[in-house]
């Protein structure tokens, strides 16, 4: 399956309007930097087949969705840059999905890698509650953000590895 | 490879302007933000100020601000340091250095080289 | 702003010695705090960040520990290429500052 190139810059768009978000100076939240185990061997993309890979990256896209689908996140961020924001996710999500279908008996293995998904949905379990333990304060969404953002730039260079494996 | 390259060596003389730069590549220069230091001959050093090259915003330490100026220019990946009027007190040495703002990363890992300015009549 | 106190400001060593330095923040800084190395010409390097966490290519014989005020960073067998001067910087709030500096000087 291809990715189309659409989703590279939907994915492009997503960095930039993340980058728009930002409600106040990130200066004056350095007291409140976290370390949220970014699972960096996730997105090697070395031990994945495909249709792995493709897999994580639908999780961490989905999970992105629903930490800022929450009511706390509406309550933070302008309501126009989110909805934008939903627009480029669900763009990404249903080119993923559509890849996954087109893997389905390409390859002998499993579509998905059952561990890689929950190390993903764990690392979200830990964002939750660093934002819940900060009570949703404005500088917790900040450094929030800029995980998100790290996230969704790492990621990006795994969807380019696998663009380059076509 | 990461790599922070500053500009070269300048002699100037009081009351001059100058402008010094800090040329980012080999990662994305707007991820980062950029601090730079002082260390003056013989001393230890001293935190000067910082730049979000995304949306230069900037920030001065007290004994700085209003002395120099911290710029960037994310299109050519530079952050620049500026002075208007060069004093004999300004003669040191200046560092470049990048710290991943709020993520969880090593503050202050890679720096450049270092411009040496020398201030004298 | 918070001041970060070194010490002792020099010391003499020999090749094998164990070498402790102290840094002590002006108050709590939690685990913000970063040690680095710098030669005579050359560009500070990261050792040490987060107090405890040594970076990347940088020899295990180097550690870190401490938290709140109290910190210290520690180099269990001392090589020569370790005489140098030591820094510690605070990285909870800006602006960041950095201790006075600690010379290893060869005994």
């Known amino acids: 399956c291809d990715l189309p190139q659409t989703h590279s810059l939907s994915n492009r768009r997503t960095l930039m309007i993340m980058a728009q978000m930002g409600r106040i100076s990130p200066f004056s939240c350095l007291k409140d930097r976290h370390d949220f185990g970014f699972p960096q061997e996730e997105f090697d993309g070395n031990q994945f087949q495909k249709a792995q890979a493709i897999s994580v990256l639908h999780e961490m896209i989905q999970q992105t969705f629903n930490l800022f689908s929450t009511k706390d996140s509406s309550a933070t961020w302008d309501e126009t840059l989110l909805d934008k924001f939903y627009t480029e996710l669900y763009q990404q999500l249903n080119d993923l999905e559509a890849c996954m279908m087109q893997e389905v008996g390409v390859e002998d293995t499993p579509l998905m890698n059952v561990d890689s998904i929950l190390t993903v949905r764990k690392y979200f379990q830990r964002i939750t509650l660093y934002l819940t333990e900060k009570k949703y304060s404005p500088c917790a969404w900040e450094v929030v953000r800029a995980e998100i953002m790290r996230s969704f730039s790492l990621s990006a260079n795994l969807q380019e590895r696998l663009r380059r494996k076509e | 490879e990461v790599q922070l390259v500053q500009s070269g060596a300048e002699v100037k003389k009081p009351g001059e302007s100058l402008k010094i730069s800090c040329k980012g590549s080999?990662?994305?220069?707007?991820?980062?933000?950029i601090g730079w230091v002082r260390q003056m001959p013989g001393k230890g050093l001293e935190w000067m100020g910082i730049?979000?090259?995304?949306?230069?915003?900037?920030r001065y330490s007290p004994s700085f601000q209003g002395q120099v100026t911290i710029s960037a220019d994310k299109s050519i990946s530079t952050a620049y340091l500026q002075w208007s009027s060069l004093k004999a007190s300004d003669t040191a040495m200046y560092y470049c250095a990048r710290h991943p703002g709020l993520n969880w990363a090593p503050d202050f890992d890679y720096w450049g080289q270092g411009t040496l300015v020398t201030v004298s009549s | 702003d918070i001041q970060m106190t070194q010490s002792p400001s020099s010391l003499s060593a020999s090749v094998g010695d164990r070498v402790t330095i102290t840094c002590r923040a002006s108050?709590?800084?939690?685990?913000?705090l970063n040690w680095y190395q710098q030669k005579p010409g050359k560009a500070p390097k990261l050792l040490i960040y987060?107090?405890?966490s040594l970076q990347s290519g940088v020899p295990s014989r180097f550690s870190g520990s401490g938290s709140g005020t109290d910190f210290t960073l520690t180099i269990s067998s001392l090589q020569p290429e370790d005489f140098a001067t030591y820094y510690c910087q605070q990285a909870i709030d800006l602006p960041f500052t950095f201790g006075q500096g600690t010379k290893v000087e060869i005994k």
């Open positions: 987060a107090a405890s």
């Open positions: 080999g990662y994305s220069f707007t991820s980062y933000w």
């Open positions: 108050q709590s800084i939690n685990r913000f």
């Open positions: 730049i979000d090259p995304s949306d230069s915003d900037t």
